[in-house]
Interface confidence: low
């Protein structure tokens, strides 16, 4: 499929101008190669009309230009003084006309409307409101006022002052007769439909002295805004429909066959299953505007999207709408990363998050997508040393391996951790990716004691048992804190006896704490890694207490099978400030995630995304 993208249809009127934008992947080669606009012939060739190398056909002389914007990956063709002869099929493309790096564009130039003299033209967007003003003379002040629509050869009554309303306009039209001072009546039609377009006639009086006024109503279908985004990236649709629909339900839908528009998300709580875990509808402003963020873009997300307002929360005739044509570029700069990561209860996952490598200094974030209402994504951890209180000791964001990827490790997994998580930064908002964590049946691979109490001044050894499957991995112990996990010296004490059917390659690696102090209290992790890529981890909380006791204490594996002492764990937690994105609009705007705080801890329902790209908890 060609990665070039532009408008499928362009409509205009004789004498007007059009501006056609074509998008291309902004690679170094593409930025500098020839750009062209050509007209397709009946026999399949494509005759160049204008190119970026300076060529302009005689048909376009003095009325067209082509401008390349390499930094945006776009070029624009402007054509003026359009005639009906310009109607036809065109291509915008890169390189040689016949090479296929192009996009088909249909240009339709229609005749301007033949208007009667003294006709007032009203040009209004679909779904909006028009007020047709109709002046009259004093002698007709007390006479019947009416509005007709010209249907073929005949005028059809739409509304009159005796109370008649044409059924096609019921509930969306009114006739206002101003106070006696003003010789004017107005007809207001709202929720405009395409079928409302046409010639109208206002009339005051019914005899030969009646006052008449012609009006031409043009109802505009919104031209879709072209949106060009990378596969696996994200898109934000900003929808501003105006304050008059501020209190009406909003929706985003995707056009399927014909005129159908399937709801993607709406403010009444509906959400299409295909977007579960990767969509947020951001709260409305007072003016009724809102935005929708979709992450983890897929090929099948490409298409035409409409946002609108209607009490049903879906597209209806007369809904005010805005339109976008989304193209998903498969030559993506965003690397593949697993969309599903699996872990077992009590075990861990290590999630790789891609980011724009040009923004290595940006703040990295990880948040939990919550589907309730319109979706939100409260932050769990960031790269500046903040971790949500409930995740202390079991969650860490590491800048490794770097160069466009960071790592998030979550351990002590429970079924409540199943769900969708977003990787994001305060830099390029297009680099938002989604990963689903699934909790599957099984036992954690690493075995550690459930809880450990150390005595001040003593020496403590905490064991971690690694099965033979990790024989080639680097094994480590570290002390967890808000900014990561600081490596500690550890001792390989030989083969472990903790695993059945595991040869001499299983290992027991101990953490030794000499002369325990209060500062040693906290969370310790043992784990495996290969270079800068992290695998499984297991966590132990070490509590410190005063007790007169001699010698050192070994913590045996027998304790590892004991259930963790929840009281010790709870008392060990140090409440720190809790942080989340309170205003999800920050996702939708090109700016940093604000340093706001939120105590909310929402539901963790998991819905299968149906992805085939999966990652086990211990693989990378």
């Amino acid at each position: 499929k060609s990665p070039i993208f532009g408008p499928e249809e362009v409509n205009s009127v004789e004498g007007n101008s059009v501006s056609i934008t074509c998008y291309y992947p902004p690679t170094s080669v593409n930025r500098h190669t020839r750009k062209y606009w050509c007209r397709q012939g009946a026999r399949g060739g494509c005759i160049t009309l204008i190119s970026s190398e300076g060529y302009v056909s005689s048909k376009y002389a003095g009325r067209a230009n082509l401008t390349n914007f390499p930094e945006n990956g776009t070029f624009v063709v402007n054509i003026a003084q359009l005639s009906q002869d310009d109607s036809g099929r065109y291509k915008c493309g890169l390189g040689i006309n016949s090479r296929g790096l192009s996009f088909d564009v249909s240009l339709e130039v229609s005749q301007g409307p033949g208007l009667l003299n003294d006709t007032k033209v009203y040009t209004v967007d679909l779904g909006r409101t028009v007020t047709i003003n109709c002046p009259f003379k004093t002698e007709n002040a007390q006479k019947r006022k009416s509005l007709y629509k010209q249907i073929g050869l005949y005028p059809v009554l739409v509304i009159d002052s005796s109370g008649y309303v044409n059924p096609n306009y019921t509930g969306r039209i009114r006739l206002d007769i101003q106070g006696t001072g003003q010789l004017l009546f107005s007809v207001v039609i709202n929720q405009l439909r395409l079928s409302d377009a046409g010639q109208y006639l206002c009339q005051a009086g019914d005899d030969s002295n009646s006052n008449k006024k012609n009006a031409d109503l043009q109802v505009l279908k919104p031209e879709p805004e072209l949106v060009y985004e990378d596969l696996r990236g994200s898109v934000t649709f900003h929808c501003a429909l105006g304050p008059e629909v501020a209190n009406v339900a909003k929706f985003l839908c995707r056009q399927s066959s014909g005129e159908n528009c399937d709801v993607v998300v709406n403010t009444l709580g509906k959400r299409a299953p295909a977007f579960e875990g990767r969509i947020l509808l951001n709260p409305q402003d007072k003016d009724g505007s809102f935005s929708v963020v979709i992450t983890g873009l897929r090929k099948e997300d490409a298409g035409r999207y409409l946002c609108g307002a209607h009490s049903d929360g879906q597209l209806q005739e007369g809904s005010p709408i805005q339109a976008w044509q989304l193209f998903v570029n498969e030559e993506s700069t965003i690397p593949r990363s697993p969309t599903v990561v699996k872990g077992v209860a009590g075990g861990s996952v290590a999630v790789l998050c891609p980011y724009n490598r040009k923004e290595s200094k940006s703040i990295k974030y990880w948040c939990l997508w919550e589907g309730a209402q319109n979706g939100r994504c409260p932050l769990l951890v960031d790269s500046e040393g903040w971790v949500k209180a409930q995740y202390e000791g079991r969650l860490s964001l590491l800048e490794e391996p770097g160069n466009g990827t960071f790592t998030v490790i979550l351990n002590q997994l429970t079924s409540r951790d199943a769900g969708f998580y977003w990787c994001l930064t305060n830099g390029d908002t297009l680099w938002r990716t989604t990963v689903e964590i699934k909790i599957i049946e099984g036992e954690p691979n690493l075995k550690v004691p459930g809880n450990v109490t150390a005595v001040l001044g003593e020496t403590l050894k905490v064991p971690c048992h690694f099965p033979c499957k990790f024989s080639s991995y680097e094994k480590y112990w570290c002390k967890w804190n808000n900014t990561g996990c600081q490596a500690l010296p550890s001792q390989d004490e030989g083969p472990s006896k903790a695993f059945v059917n595991c040869d001499e390659n299983s290992r027991l690696v101990s953490l030794t704490l000499n002369l325990v102090t209060r500062a040693d209290e906290g969370w310790y992790w043992c784990g495996v890694k290969q270079g800068h890529f992290y695998g499984e981890t297991a966590a132990v909380y070490v509590a410190v207490e005063e007790r007169k006791a001699a010698g050192s204490r070994d913590v045996s594996l027998a304790k590892a099978d004991a259930a963790p002492d929840e009281k010790v764990l709870d008392s060990g937690f140090r409440e720190i400030e809790n942080k989340a994105i309170q205003d999800p609009r920050l996702f939708a705007e090109e700016k940093a995630v604000a340093d706001t705080r939120d105590q909310a801890d929402g539901s963790r329902a998991s819905v299968d995304s149906g992805s085939s790209e999966e990652q086990g908890g211990s693989s990378r």
Epitope: R172, D176, I177
Partner: nanobody, 121 residues
Framework: EVQLVESGGGLVQSGGSLRLSCAAS????????MGWFRQAPGKERELVAV????????SYADSVKGRFTISRSNAKNTVYLQMSSLKPEDTAVYYC??????????????WGQGTQVTVSS
């Protein structure tokens, strides 16, 4: 269809005040002009005050100008008539009316059942 229910009528002394309310049910209340009319025994129904859909235009009978005020709340689907400096000749059944057309005649499409206002001297 619009259904209208008036309330707030009653007996009041001359010079007193009353506030009538008219609650509308049905769709698109804010697209209707609303009016208050009255009918005294043995007399024709007459216009008291009307207000357009937005509240931006109002019209009053000469006999009530400066004493009565019509207003509306589209959020509450209600139109009000604040009556002060009441006179015995204001005694009548007061009717609320609605129409998609703002007019100062009696040709309104939808009517309430009425509420009695009696002003004693």
């Amino acid at each position: 269809e619009v259904q209208l229910v008036e309330s707030g009528g009653g007996l009041v002394q001359s010079g007193g005040s009353l506030r009538l309310s008219c609650a509308a049910s049905g769709r698109a209340f804010n697209y209707y002009a609303m009016g208050w009319f009255r009918q005294a025994p043995g007399k024709e129904r007459e216009l008291v005050a009307v207000i357009n859909w937005s509240g931006g235009t109002t019209s009053y009978a000469d006999s009530v100008k400066g004493r009565f005020t019509i207003s509306r709340s589209n959020a509450k689907n209600t139109v009000y008539l604040q009556m002060s400096s009441l006179k015995p000749e204001d005694t009548a059944v007061y009717y609320c009316a609605a129409d998609s057309i703002y007019r100062t005649s009696k040709d309104y499409n939808y009517w309430g059942q009425g509420t009695q206002v009696t002003v004693s001297s």
